[in-house]
Interface confidence: low
């Protein structure tokens, strides 16, 4: 995250950092819990890396540096990437982790509400962006999970911002014109959230963005409202019955 | 674990042949440009060879085109490079590697093997 | 095919000085330069991708610039632990590496 400050514990209890063990562990997306063994994340997370035990789940966790070899954390069960991603494409950049097991909820481990399906007509003012990601482009990754307020943009003024690709219907925007504010490496994955009528729901995927927090060039984020009916089948068809966190 | 395990290596006279192995784990290696790389003693590091991910497009450095051969079986997760005609300037630890690089903000990786050394000698 | 010349060839210097190498492209090759540190018995490790991104988990005082020919790998404040052979790497067209740079203690 650019330009942000640290966060409290329980303040984004759904936030999770999913960890790869390569040679050495470390952190590579953000992704948001939305059920008891429902993680939500980006599909471009896993390219390449989709075999289940490589991965690592840390959940109800503020500060990287307190992860030890006794911290625990969640395996995967199946991850479910989007059947319309593609890796050269920035399209549909969305998956689903199930856990090996549930998650108990806590004050510091909890879910995030989803929005409505074809949520298009609620007007979003406060929004943001969490993650452990860089805080600039040429930076590293974070110890404290990292908040920034930004604001939404419409598509129209976002694909004038990115010429050379298509911002679609399935896609959300922000970012800040003069720049300085924005997700970066490490938060891809993480929730977009907006707090609307006193409660916070998973507005977008942080996804893509050409470098971080520069001028003009907002973050792109996957539009969970425009995904509704694929996680509620995903997860129903896994689960026999729905476990999500909506608000409807 | 995401892993790249070279062998095959040893003692070759010059004119012999030798193949390499590099099997990889804990990574969806069907999908990527797969490559071997070489250094000889106290030298620095020279491309080999590369394979895309079906195997149909392989590519060859000047110095080994017409002697060396790199294939790829996806369904056993490993990589080959079969050398023939060997000779003593081919003496050197070799390396089989891999890169994934994203789009913009997306995470890369880069994954050696621990190399196999490979002497031609008389 | 696409050569890569790097210089110099060994570099002498003291932890705490600012180092940088240079690596000049036979013909463009935008900015699909990788920069690597490889130290003896080892096999190398990406540093940066792209001309100027960093590899996840490398730290920040390593910095990488330049596109078309002419790129150029800065480390701001040598460590200790920086002490180790350098190669630019380009992959616009397969790959070639430059011939290294022996970063050394002064």
């Known amino acids: 995250i650019v330009g942000g400050t640290n966060s409290s514990w329980g303040e984004w209890p759904w936030q999770v950092s999913l960890q790869v063990k390569l040679t050495a562990q470390r952190h590579l997306c953000g992704g948001s819990l939305i059920g008891h063994q429902w993680v939500l994340t980006a599909a471009h997370c896993f390219d390449g890396l989709p075999l289940q035990d490589v991965w690592r789940i840390y959940s109800g966790i503020l500060n990287l540096s307190d992860i030890t070899k006794d911290t625990p954390f969640s395996q995967i069960k199946e991850i479910i990437i989007h059947q319309n991603y593609k890796v050269s494409e920035g399209n549909h950049d969305i998956a689903l982790i199930k856990l090996q097991a549930p998650l108990n909820y806590t004050e510091f481990q909890k879910p995030i509400c989803l929005p409505s399906k074809g949520d298009t007509s609620t007007i979003y003012t406060n929004c943001w962006v969490t993650g452990w990601g860089f805080s600039k482009e040429k930076g590293e990754i974070q110890n404290i999970l990292q908040k920034v307020n930004i604001p939404l943009v419409t598509n129209e003024e976002c694909q004038k911002r990115y010429q050379d690709y298509k911002i679609t219907q399935r896609m959300v925007c922000a970012g800040y014109k003069e720049g300085g504010k924005d997700a970066c490496k490490g938060d891809s994955g993480g929730p977009l959230v907006c707090k609307h009528n006193g409660m916070w729901r998973l507005v977008g995927i942080t996804s893509w963005g050409e470098g971080c927090a520069r001028r003009e060039q907002p973050g792109v984020y996957t539009k969970v409202a425009e995904y509704m009916d694929w996680i509620l089948e995903k997860t129903q068809s896994s689960d026999g019955k729905a476990q999500m966190q909506s608000p409807a | 674990e995401v892993q790249l395990l070279e062998s095959g290596g040893g003692l070759v006279q010059p004119g012999g042949s030798l193949r390499l192995s590099c099997a990889a784990s804990g990574f969806t290696f069907s999908h990527y440009i797969m490559m071997w790389v070489r250094q000889a003693p106290g030298k620095g590091l020279e491309w080999v060879s590369g394979?895309?991910?079906?195997?149909?497009?392989?590519v060859y450095a000047d110095s080994v085109k017409g002697r060396f051969t790199i294939s790829r079986d996806n369904s056993k997760n490993t990589l080959y490079l079969q050398m023939n005609s060997l000779r003593a300037e081919d003496t050197a630890v070799y390396y089989c590697?891999?890169?994934?690089?994203?789009?913009?903000?997306?995470?890369?990786?880069?994954?050696w093997g621990q190399g196999t050394m490979v002497t031609v000698s008389s | 095919d696409i050569q890569m010349t790097q210089s110099p060839s060994t570099l002498s210097a003291s932890v705490g000085d600012r180092v940088t190498i240079t690596c000049r492209a036979s013909?463009?090759?935008?900015?699909?330069l990788a920069w690597y540190q490889q130290k003896p018995g080892k096999a190398p490790k990406l540093l940066i991708y792209k001309a100027s991104t960093l590899e996840s988990g490398v730290p920040s005082r390593f910095s990488g610039s330049g596109s078309g020919t002419e790129f150029t790998l800065t480390i701001s404040s040598l460590q200790p632990d920086d002490f180790a052979t350098y190669y630019c790497q380009q992959y616009n067209t397969y790959w070639t590496f430059g011939q290294g740079t022996k970063v050394e203690i002064k």
């Open positions: 590697a891999w890169r994934r690089i994203g789009v913009p903000r997306r995470d890369s990786f880069d994954m």
């Open positions: 394979i895309y991910s079906s195997g149909g497009i392989t």
């Open positions: 013909q463009s090759i935008s900015s699909w």
